[in-house]
Amino acid sequence: QEDEDGDYEELVLALRSEEDGLAEAPEHGTTATFHRCAKDPWRLPGTYVVVLKEETHLSQSERTARRLQAQAARRGYLTKILHVFHGLLPGFLVKMSGDLLELALKLPHVDYIEEDSSVFAQSIPWNLERITPPRYRADEYQPPDGGSLVEVYLLDTSIQSDHREIEGRVMVTDFENVPEEDGTRFHRQASKCDSHGTHLAGVVSGRDAGVAKGASMRSLRVLNCQGKGTVSGTLIGLEFIRKSQLVQPVGPLVVLLPLAGGYSRVLNAACQRLARAGVVLVTAAGNFRDDACLYSPASAPEVITVGATNAQDQPVTLGTLGTNFGRCVDLFAPGEDIIGASSDCSTCFVSQSGTSQAAAHVAGIAAMMLSAEPELTLAELRQRLIHFSAKDVINEAWFPEDQRVLTPNLVAALPPSTHGAGWQLFCRTVWSAHSGPTRMATAVARCAPDEELLSCSSFSRSGKRRGERMEAQGGKLVCRAHNAFGGEGVYAIARCCLLPQANCSVHTAPPAEASMGTRVHCHQQGHVLTGCSSHWEVEDLGTHKPPVLRPRGQPNQCVGHREASIHASCCHAPGLECKVKEHGIPAPQEQVTVACEEGWTLTGCSALPGTSHVLGAYAVDNTCVVRSRDVSTTGSTSEGAVTAVAICCRSRHLAQASQELQ
């Protein structure tokens, strides 16, 4: 999940004029940017979110808004300030002519402007079975803790709060920000207006069909009776939650966003701010049978993005469309024919389908996990959701071929016990956006702020790549992959882990002149090897074969091609121990894998040798996968021999801490 993605239109206006003699004109050469939804029918021209620079105070926001109004009036334009943002993002919402955009972009403090656009409910008119661990039966589903310490905010349609399933569990706030319904003959019918939100509230915390039966909920109305809302309305809703959190701090908060619109920089930014304030956001991946990275808030990295599967663990088809997929999806959850509260009457039930229902399941699971362990951070919660998911049960053939490797094969499940997971070293795999096909194109994968980057690998479908390396960016390590000339682009793959009190660094060996190959090891006392990367400046590596197996007694060593620079990720953390595991195949094979044993976690995954017929390496759960070119093109020469190298780690410190708690 990354903000750089997509089919998102960016219209940059480079504005350097001194028009109107602004006292605080932007410094020479700075450019504010204008953004709009890439999906034309969803655009709402005439309403704009003006986002100001991060440190802008409320008084400056108000002054900037007034200045815009004054300058517009001098040109004969009427404007209306609809809302001044503060608390999450500084800025304001303005109704004005698009002719004023150039003027607005020149205002002091302006970072970017985004045209408002529509967002939509993600539902269409077996579930506890899948998320319940084997030791429970769905008909006697009694969760160990019903999420009673957690408050779940639902941003959706209005709801029928007196429905027997959710009565007394949902507090309807006075927040409402919805657009007018489309069409002159539209008749508001309470049961239709409440349908989506009521069903989802039931899925999260319903008495009979809810996941987290003890969770209390608060509803905000951001979707109208047709299930349609706006980015600006959603932003104001998120700001309302942040202000409520500041006024009356409670326990853990989960925010459920069962809606999707086109990629929105501002909506993603607001989600990031709220997540960094300690709020867990869960969203629908979208029902467009498309890359979730093209939608918001699904594409926001800080949000837990949920795709939908059915009772057979197949991706959900919804008419001609279906669940979204891709690297911006964190996991899947039940989202087909989900039984929940119906707004038709206070005891009615109905089944609905969509990624909204899937997201509601995960919001319920999150509420239960947070109720059991209220101190869990967002990163810890996400890692646990991934760890306890059912693995490799989804039929990937449903996804487009180029998305299969990027889409997590995970279906959400409740932990067998809400305690006792603390000893585990948790890791997840984060894929970058595609680099693009130019020679110098690079792709960057980043871990969340409180995760540690333990290894970095790369993958290219054409096999033309120049490897990868870990490098510092903004005080944190990132994983950067390099495309090669004539390549179709690369992905960077980061292995992101929860490793408290870790001190990690990267040790690099430049290309070796000798024919023995390049080697680098962790030489600092107490540091262990968690990952190996290699990067080369040459477009074509020769077929030099380094000695694959390390000399005995040197497990802390990375080995690579003599023309490549080799990077070792070396970490010191209490009780951390790691070992290298290799699986070599002498004959060419399209895929070679090696897995870590029970109790060990995969932190590093790389290939030997790094020559051009290797497409790359990546981690899938606890298995290191190395992919090579089609066997038929390689021939059965010795050049086809490939070794998958896994680095498996565990933390004795975490295990001891866990035992002390029990």
């Epitope: 693009g436 130019t438 020679r439 690079t442 000339f485 400046e537 040459v538």
Partner: antibody, heavy 117, light 108 residues
């Protein structure tokens, strides 16, 4: 069709600065890697800098720290800011596009930079 | 950095004759080598890339061979417009991208 139109050359004193511009048409400049190459009588063709589609920049040791390559999406243009110019920087400077599978496929018309007191 | 050398520095050929221009790299550049020609007062123009692939619009009389460190550009039958400077360039090891010093093909 693809075109690269250069401007900004001229005579400058040693230690001075100059900014070369290259306006692209017929393609989206930010989807390609762009280079500056210079040609002097004594040295032949010499690669001077590059900016990748993802914004990474590259320079040879001879100009590192003195030359800066940038691009501006809105104007579909690439620039070369040259500071602390020396007599050895005197050359015709070319703006060059690199194709995805073809090396330096389109060249600007060239602009002469003369560094002399 | 990889050094590129070209020989001869000048090649005198009669129109209609065959010309062979040599380019050598100081270390292997695989087949990541390009040839350009340049007429006086004009920018260089790409002829061959990947050591042997003709660029769009380049006549069949131009061909390239070689890989590793030794490369040759062959012009099977020189036309009047072919009398110009010819440069080779390696793009395997970068930065920097390096060019040969050039061969001048002149009318005999």
């Amino acid at each position: 069709q693809v075109q690269l139109v250069q401007s900004g050359g001229g005579l400058v004193q040693p230690g001075g600065s100059l900014r070369l511009s290259c306006a692209a048409s017929g393609f989206t400049l930010s989807s390609y890697d762009m280079h500056w190459v210079r040609q002097s009588t004594g040295k032949g063709l010499e690669w001077v800098s590059a900016i990748g589609s993802t914004g990474d920049t590259y320079y040879p040791g001879s100009v590192k720290g003195r030359f800066t390559i940038t691009r501006e999406k809105a104007k579909n243009s690439v620039y070369l800011q040259m500071n602390s110019l020396r007599a050895g920087d005197t050359a015709v400077y070319y703006c060059v596009r690199e194709g995805w599978e073809v090396p330096f496929d389109y060249w600007g018309q060239g602009t002469l930079v003369t560094v002399s007191s | 950095d990889i050094q590129m050398t070209q020989s001869p520095a000048t090649l005198s050929v009669s129109p209609g004759e065959r010309a062979a221009l040599s380019c050598r790299a100081s270390q292997s550049v695989s087949s990541n080598l390009a040839w350009y020609h340049q007429k006086p007062g004009q920018a260089p123009r790409l002829l061959i890339y990947g050591a042997s692939t003709r660029a769009t619009g380049i006549p069949a009389r131009f061909s390239g061979i070689g890989s590793g460190t030794e490369f040759t550009l062959i012009i099977s039958s020189l036309q009047s417009e072919d009398f110009a400077f010819y440069f080779c360039q390696q793009y395997n090891n970068w930065p920097p991208f390096t060019f040969g010093p050039g061969t001048k093909v002149e009318i005999k």
